[in-house]
Interface confidence: low
């Protein structure tokens, strides 16, 4: 497993290891997250042929994964700093069920997948503690959330299979937008 | 007027340490990010990587573990560490408008040449 | 990790004509767009001429043009003039930061 942010600071520019600031942490952490989501996606990839699927296929899903949106202003044409972080940090609460999902999906990565949902919600407190603009921030409701993962876990091997690809296809995805977006905040 | 003067360079013998500075003058490096991309002689461009407003850092997959960065408000720092005389080359430092690194490299140096021989 | 390829050098053209040099990005760029053009002389540092695959950039005269989304792109030099002659590179901006990358470079002869 990758070495958890803070323990290791060789990719932050820091020549007399300073503390880190808030925007330091929260861009380790990102990419801390997605070196975690990388060994998963190896996995998955080695277990399975959902990698060679082709986007047109793999689109023809009926989850509602978070994707950025011209509209939520991450974007640099029509950036915009609330409106963004809001985004972010909902997408985040959104990703947390489907996170919960892939804890039972991988044998020789268990440890890993744990790491990365752990990591998510240590970013999301990050990222609260930078946003002002709390109340516009909708937690998703737990009893949705139990009733999609209970449909998730009763779908046969090969839609498992389907969405566990899926989602860590995404989760990288929305982790990268939200990586550059950050980085002008 | 804006410009940046790259310095440091030089012979420097294999398994070494070297480090070059980019100096910038008429607007501070704080508002931009700074890009690294060498030059081997006769040979095309080649990214080694970026720090960014807020003192963060990527690498180019093939230069990570090779070269560190760091900044001040005024220069930007390349260490190279354990060279070799395939990293014989001209250094540039690039400044980058917008959010790809190097989605606008509009302000270059004139590099630095830094040769690897024993 | 992803590769531009450029149209193999040298591609030349007479002074007042049209060249065309091709980048084709194994991947799509970041947003489709994140592609730049430079122009880079013997002894010069490069120098940026198109940016977001078709925004020329200040003081770039309007007979360079660029064009192209997603994998592949075109660099188009109408009128080309003597001073055109140089080693012209396209680069590219991937989703992951650390794939960011340049062509290899397309020699322009001017005969």
């Known amino acids: 497993a990758p070495v958890p942010p803070g323990e290791d600071s060789k990719d932050v520019a820091a020549p007399h290891r300073q503390p880190l600031t808030s925007s330091e942490r929260i861009d380790k952490q990102i990419r801390y997250i997605l070196d975690g989501i990388s060994a998963l996606r190896k996995e998955t990839c080695n277990k399975s042929n959902m990698c060679e699927s082709s986007k047109e296929a793999l689109a023809e899903n009926n989850l509602n994964l978070p994707k950025m949106a011209e509209k939520d202003g991450c974007f640099q044409s029509g950036f915009n700093e609330e409106t963004c972080l809001v985004k972010i940090i909902t997408g985040l609460l959104e990703f947390e069920v489907y996170l919960e999902y892939l804890q039972n999906r991988f044998e020789s990565s268990e440890e890993q997948a744990r790491a990365v949902q752990m990591s998510t919600k240590v970013l999301i407190q990050f990222l609260q503690k930078k946003a002002k603009n709390l109340d516009a921030i909708t937690t998703p409701d737990p009893t949705t959330n139990a009733s999609l993962l209970t449909k998730l876990q009763a779908q046969n091997q090969w839609l498992q299979d389907m969405t566990t690809h899926l989602i860590l296809r995404s989760f990288k995805e929305f982790l990268q937008s939200s990586l550059r977006a950050l980085r002008q905040m | 007027q804006e410009q940046l003067k790259e310095s440091g360079g030089g012979l420097v013998t294999p398994g070494g340490t070297l480090t070059l500075t980019c100096t910038a003058s008429?607007?501070?490096?704080?508002?931009?990010?700074m890009n690294w991309v060498r030059q081997a002689p006769g040979k095309g461009l080649e990214w080694i990587g970026f720090i960014t407003l807020n003192n963060n850092v990527a690498y180019a997959n093939w230069a990570k573990g090779r070269f560190t960065f760091s900044k001040t408000s005024t220069t930007v720092d390349l260490k190279m560490t354990s060279p070799t005389p395939e990293d014989t080359a001209t250094y540039f430092c690039?400044?980058?408008?917008?959010?790809?690194?190097?989605?606008?490299?509009?302000?270059w140096g004139h590099g630095t040449l830094v040769t690897v021989s024993s | 990790d992803p590769v531009l390829t450029q149209t193999p050098s040298p591609v030349s053209a007479p002074v007042g004509g049209t060249v065309s040099i091709s980048c084709q990005a194994s991947?799509?760029?970041?947003?489709?767009?994140?592609l730049s053009w430079f122009q880079q002389k013997p002894g010069q540092p490069p120098k940026l001429l198109i940016y977001g695959a078709s925004t020329l950039d200040s003081g770039v005269p309007s007979r360079f043009k660029g064009s192209g989304s997603g994998t592949q792109f075109t660099l188009t030099i109408t009128d080309v003039q003597c001073d055109d002659a140089a080693t012209y590179y396209c680069?590219?901006?991937?989703?992951?930061?650390?794939?960011?990358?340049f062509g290899g470079g397309t020699e322009v002869v001017v005969k």
């Open positions: 008429g607007f501070s490096l704080n508002a931009y990010y």
């Open positions: 991947q799509s760029v970041y947003e489709n767009n994140y």
């Open positions: 690039a400044r980058s408008r917008g959010w790809g690194a190097m989605g606008r490299l509009d302000l």
């Open positions: 680069a590219g901006v991937y989703d992951d930061d650390s794939d960011d990358a």
